[in-house]
């Protein structure tokens, strides 16, 4: 039994880090493998993560971490029984993938303005809370070419757009994702999408 693709890990900078790797053949990850992780430098306990299968030869492990600070560094040991298959380390602050925003809502009752709001996925005491920026994706269910991205570079989790920038009388969907420049994070996953019917009063044209 060998590791074909070494574990790579990302942290949500809150409570979970996710590590994925591939074995050289079909593996029952949960019965055959264990990933041990332990904080370096400070007094701490070695914790065991039981991996799950992620495709035939792929494994994924969710490492529980009650909090994260920038200095944290973990040793990672991948075991198959008594055999050490791989040894490495992981610094969560250098591999951050934020949590996806939630509760995306489209408010269509503000004159001819669309107000999109969503929730910051972090509590106020988490460092990322005040450092997230967002991308909002809006697309038409009828027209695949009608696909747009709005970058929200301010901290407030909301976006206002004129309803007239979208076609009237058709359905649109929106979703949002987040990233944090301070830690050069990857983008989060997209939030679940929300759907609305776009309609607005066409301006009266005088001839």
């Amino acid at each position: 039994m060998k590791v074909l693709q070494e574990p790579t890990c990302v942290s949500d900078y809150m409570s979970i880090s996710t590590c994925e790797w591939k074995m050289n053949g079909p593996t029952n990850c949960s019965t055959e493998l264990r990933l041990l992780y332990q904080l370096v430098f400070l007094l701490s306990e070695a914790h065991t993560c039981i991996p799950e299968n992620n495709g035939g030869a792929g494994c994924v492990c969710h490492l529980l971490m009650d909090d994260v600070v920038s200095a944290d560094n973990y040793t990672l040991d991948l075991w198959a029984g008594q055999q050490l298959l791989w040894k490495g380390s992981f610094k969560p602050s250098e591999h951050v993938k934020p949590r996806a925003p939630g509760n995306l809502t489209v408010h269509t009752n503000v004159s001819d303005t669309l107000l999109l709001t969503w929730s910051n996925p972090y509590p106020p005491d988490n460092y990322l809370y005040n450092h997230l920026t967002y991308a909002v994706n809006i697309w038409s269910e009828n027209d695949p070419a009608d696909f747009r991205i709005y970058n929200v570079t301010y901290l407030e989790p909301s976006l206002r757009i004129a309803a007239s920038t979208l076609k009237s009388g058709i359905s649109y969907r929106a979703r949002v994702r987040a990233w944090a420049q301070c830690y050069n994070t990857t983008w989060s996953e997209w939030s679940p999408s929300t759907k609305w019917h776009n309609s607005y009063r066409e301006p009266f044209e005088q001839h």
Epitope: L39, F41, L42, L43, S44, E45, A46, H47, T48, M65, D66, D67, V69, S70, A71
Partner: antibody, heavy 118, light 106 residues
Amino acid sequence: EVTLKESGPVLVKPTETLTLTCTVSGFSLTNYGVHWIRQPPGKALEWLGVIWSGGSTDYNAAFKSRLTISKDNSKSQVVLTMTNMDPVDTATYYCARNKGTRPVFDYWGQGTTVTVSS
Amino acid sequence: DIQMTQSPSSLSASVGDRVTITCRASENIYSYLAWYQQKPGKAPKLLIYNAKTLAEGVPSRFSGSGSGTDFTLTISSLQPEDFATYYCQHYVSPLTFGQGTKLEIK
């Protein structure tokens, strides 16, 4: 409600062995580590050692040769044994729960005062 | 072992005052520092960990800052129940505490 309570002798003679028990409730010893900390009268706190949720232990090097920490998960009890007691070991002894992955103490026992005297 | 030096060892203040207690580590401990409050005859109570994270149920008038070797605990507006002894603690092995700062009523 999370509680920890220390019990054991109030008075120990020099060279004797001290055995203290920490009985916990409101959480499982299979999920949390438990530390022992002591405080001599009028002095600062001093960390003695810890038994982790998995049963492994870490000790302050200054006490390692005469300190043993063990536990019985089913009884929710952690036991501290310190050999060759000396009058300088007179202190209030506390057990405390480890908070998550950080060795900080979010719940403490009320402490038990141990006097070492002949 | 890493030594923790607290200052001052004691201080007098009045209700409503802003108070700062400092803790210095003999070497870099990053942000691996906690603060505790202890009242006479009682067990210590966790106030802050990771240098600045407020423990559950601790009033927001308490705050912590610093990283590396220099740390501070600040009480923005002293309340009568805040008069106690305060300890810092780092969590590198072996764990050590500062010698304490006794906060008394002026």
